[in-house]
C-alpha cells in the first residue's frame, strides 16, 4: 500500500469481523423492527479511483470510531468482556499500523483533503449510530442492529483496502 503496512493488516481486519460475528448475543430475527437506515457513505468506499491517502484515512477513521463505540461503559454492559477485550486489542494494533502508514503518506505529500474529508463524513455517520443507541435506550436489539451495521461497513471498507492492494500489485507487475 505504498508503506510498510504489515501483510497481516488484512488478516487483522478479517479477525475483527470474526470477533464482531462471535459477539452476537441474541437472535437478529428478534430485532427486525429495529432496523434503521444509518446512511453509510457507500460512495466513499465504492470508487474505482482509489488514492492511498483516502483509503488509509477511511480505514483509520472507521477503526477509531469502532474502537470508541465499543470502548464505553454502555458497551461493556452489553457485550461479552473477553470478546470485547480481544476486539479492543485487535483494533488498537490496526490503528497503530495505520498511523505509521498515514504519517508516511502525508510525508509523501498526498493531499490533506483526502484525509480530512472522509474523517468528517464518517464522524457524522457514527454520530447517527450513537444517537440511535441512545434513542433505543441501549437495548439488546439496538446493539445487535449496530453490530451488524458495523460488520457491513467494515466489510465494505476492508474490500476497498483489498482493491487498492491488488491495484498496487498489478502496477508492480507491469
Amino acid at each position: 500500500l505504498g508503506c510498510d503496512l504489515p501483510q497481516n493488516h488484512g488478516l487483522l481486519s478479517r479477525n475483527t469481523l470474526v470477533l464482531l460475528h462471535q459477539m452476537r448475543r441474541i437472535s437478529p430475527f428478534l430485532c427486525l423492527k429495529d432496523r434503521r437506515d444509518f446512511r453509510f457513505p457507500q460512495e466513499m468506499v465504492k470508487g474505482s479511483q482509489l488514492q492511498k491517502a483516502h483509503v488509509m484515512s477511511v480505514l483509520h477513521e472507521m477503526l477509531q470510531q469502532i474502537f470508541s463505540l465499543f470502548h464505553t461503559e454502555r458497551s461493556s454492559a452489553a457485550w461479552n468482556m473477553t470478546l470485547l477485550d480481544q476486539l479492543h486489542t485487535g483494533l488498537h494494533q490496526q490503528l497503530q499500523h495505520l498511523e505509521t502508514c498515514l504519517l508516511q503518506v502525508v510525508g509523501e505529500g498526498e493531499s490533506a483533503g483526502a484525509i480530512s474529508s472522509p474523517a468528517l463524513t464518517l464522524r457524522r455517520y457514527f454520530q447517527g449510530i450513537r444517537v440511535y443507541l441512545k434513542e433505543k435506550k441501549y437495548s439488546d436489539c439496538a446493539w445487535e442492529v449496530v453490530r451488524m451495521e458495523i460488520m457491513k461497513s467494515l466489510f465494505l471498507s476492508t474490500n476497498m483496502q483489498e482493491r487498492l492492494r491488488s491495484k498496487d500489485r498489478d502496477l508492480g507487475s507491469s
Epitope: P28, F29, L32, K33, R35, V145, M148
Partner: antibody
Framework: EVQLVQSGAEVKKPGESLKISCKGS????????IGWVRQMPGKGLEWMGI????????AYSPSFQGQVTISADKSISTAYLQWSSLKASDTAMYYC??????????????WGQGTLVTVSS | DIQMTQSPSSLSASVGDRVTITCRAS???????LNWYQQKPGKAPKLLIY???SLQSGVPSRFSGSGSGTDFTLTISSLQPEDFATYYC?????????FGQGTKVEIK
Amino acid sequence: EVQLVQSGAEVKKPGESLKISCKGSGYSFTSYWIGWVRQMPGKGLEWMGIIDPSDSDTAYSPSFQGQVTISADKSISTAYLQWSSLKASDTAMYYCARHPGLNWAPDFDYWGQGTLVTVSS
Amino acid sequence: DIQMTQSPSSLSASVGDRVTITCRASQSIDNNNLNWYQQKPGKAPKLLIYAASSLQSGVPSRFSGSGSGTDFTLTISSLQPEDFATYYCQQGYDWPLTFGQGTKVEIK
C-alpha cells in the same frame, strides 16, 4: 454478478420427502439471509421462512412452521428447503431470495429462478 | 400478522397511461420498510422500489413509490408495453413478512 441458482423441477408422490436447493454466488453468502417464498398455481406470493446462513438460525411463517425445514451449508453457499412428507397441496413454484438481515438495504433484491414442485399420485 | 391489502386487484390500461396501485397495511409500518415487486408470467419477481420510495438500481425512473405509516402507493408515470405484469407490495417491518395479494396490470 450476484446469482441465486435453484435446483430443477421435481415431480413427487404424496408422502414422499424432498429437498430443494438454492446456491448463492457473486456475494458474501453469510452476510445475507436467504428467504423462501411459495407461489401456488395462479396465486400470489407467500413468505415461508428465512435462514441466516452464518449460523443457520431460522424463522418461519406460522403457516409453514412444522410443515417445512429450512437449512443451509455455508461451506458450499447453499440454502435448502425440505419436506418430510409431501401433500398434493404443496404443488407450487418455490423461490429463494436474498435478504439483507438487519442492515438497511432492499429486502429480497435478488431471486432464484424458482423450482416447480408437482405432487401428484 | 400485518395484513397487506392492494387495490385494485386488476386494472386495464393503455400504453402511455399513468397507473397508480395502492397498498394498505393493517398496522403502521413505522420504519417505512415497504417494498414493491413486479412479476411477469413464468418469471421470478423483480424488486422495483424499497423503503417505500427508493428506486432499486437499474429500474426505470417512470416507477416511483410514496407513502408512510399504513398507506403506500406505486406509480407508473407512463405505462410501457413491458410493464404489463402483476405487482406486489411487501412489508419488511415485522414477522411474518407479508405480501399484498397482487395487482394485475393488463392491456386495455
